[in-house]
């Protein structure tokens, strides 16, 4: 499933929105990492357009901010990308998923560096 700013022509929706999302997920990434967030819709069906919001501001897809169906990817993350992210139903602003993202200054260490 490719991410990017390409447009998706959407067909009819299968379901009406499901229940409210649970508590927010807390995620930590290293500087330079790609922040990847996934938010499958409740009930599994599309529910109209969605928007990713960071600290109250809607995110517009760009070369660094990639949006796919129910997915967000922020490339080459830095400390400024830390914050509260939510995936919302565009029409009602109903929160579908909630994430607390922290980007640490140090790059994340790979598994191959352990025990060397």
């Amino acid at each position: 499933e490719s991410l990017g700013t390409e447009q998706r022509v959407v067909g009819r929706a299968a379901e009406v929105p499901g229940p409210e999302p649970g508590q927010q997920e807390q995620l930590v990434f290293g500087s330079g990492d790609a922040v990847e967030l996934s938010c499958p819709p409740p009930g599994g069906g599309p529910m109209g357009p969605t928007v990713w919001v960071k600290d109250g501001t809607g995110l517009v897809p760009s070369e660094r901010v990639l949006v796919g169906p129910q997915r967000l990817q922020v490339l080459n993350a830095s400390h400024e990308d830390s914050g509260a992210y939510s995936c919302r139903q565009r029409l009602t602003q109903r929160v579908l998923c909630h994430f607390s993202v922290r980007v640490t200054d140090a790059p994340s260490s790979g598994d191959d560096e352990d025990g060397e």
């Epitope: 998706r8 022509v9 009819r12 357009p49 969605t50 990713w52 501001t57 995110l59």
Partner: antibody
Framework: EVQLLESGGGLVQPGGSLRLSCAAS????????MSWVRQAPGKGLEWVSG????????YYADSVKGRFTISRDNSKNTLYLQMNSLRAEDTAVYYC??????????????WGQGTLVTVSS | QSVLTQPPSASGTPGQRVTISCSGS????????VSWYQQLPGTAPKLLIY???KRPSGVPDRFSGSKSGTSASLAISGLRSEDEADYYC???????????FGGGTKLTVL
């Protein structure tokens, strides 16, 4: 001041094509969702298509699906509607409408003045 | 026939309060917000109410919106002659994956 200026309307024969443009100014065009809404003479409003910035999705009314294509050029602050295989029932004033901020509830908060499309032989 | 049902006409005298209804279903009004638009003769529509009951800046508080279940209403109090216009309700419809408008209500100020 937000301004939306439609152009490209006119008289076209059934089966023909037309491309409408909507030049936007007074706001950060790329950050806003946009729609086309039409109104046949003496009739009510009908939503035609919408293009959504937040997830890149595009939606169409059943009546135009497969015939009309919505697109945008953010570098030119312009919204387009490519209309193919036009029918008499597509005759209407076509309005370009701007949605509210992405982090607020959806609504058409600004409208252009409209451009008339007449499909007739 | 429109997905959202509005009375074709309504009327009132200056100073009166009039209400315009908009009836839908669970796939639109029942699970989504309603917005209302005013269209004066020969002009483009203008946003009056969004998110069921919110008023954009510049819209007089004589205009108010409400919703219950799958129906919504627009109320205009202190009716004025300049309120004579067509009024449309709108909502997203999940089963159609698109916006739907009511057929419109022509308001006459007697």
């Amino acid at each position: 001041e937000v301004q939306l200026l439609e152009s490209g309307g006119g008289l076209v024969q059934p089966g023909g094509s037309l491309r409408l443009s909507c030049a936007a100014s007074g706001f950060t065009f790329s950050s806003y969702d946009m729609s086309w809404v039409r109104q046949a003479p003496g009739k009510g409003l009908e939503w035609v298509s919408g293009i959504y910035s937040g997830d890149g999705s595009i939606y169409y009314a059943d009546s135009v699906k497969g015939r009309f294509t919505i697109s945008r050029d953010n570098s030119k602050n312009t919204l387009y509607l490519q209309m193919n295989s036009l029918r008499a029932e597509d005759t209407a004033v076509y309005y370009c409408a701007k949605d509210g901020p992405m982090n607020e509830e959806s609504r058409f908060d600004y409208w252009g003045q409209g451009t008339l499309v007449t499909v007739s032989s | 026939q429109s997905v959202l049902t509005q009375p074709p006409s309504a009327s009132g005298t200056p100073g009166q309060r009039v209400t315009i209804s908009c009836s839908g279903s669970s796939s639109n009004i029942g699970n989504n917000y309603v917005s209302w638009y005013q269209q004066l003769p020969g002009t483009a529509p203008k946003l009056l109410i969004y998110a069921d009951s919110k008023r954009p800046s510049g819209v007089p508080d004589r205009f108010s919106g409400s919703k219950s279940g799958t129906s919504a209403s627009l109320a205009i109090s202190g009716l004025r002659s300049e309120d004579e216009a067509d009024y449309y309700c709108a909502s997203w419809d999940y089963s159609l994956s698109g916006y739907v408008f009511g057929g419109g209500t022509k308001l006459t100020v007697l």
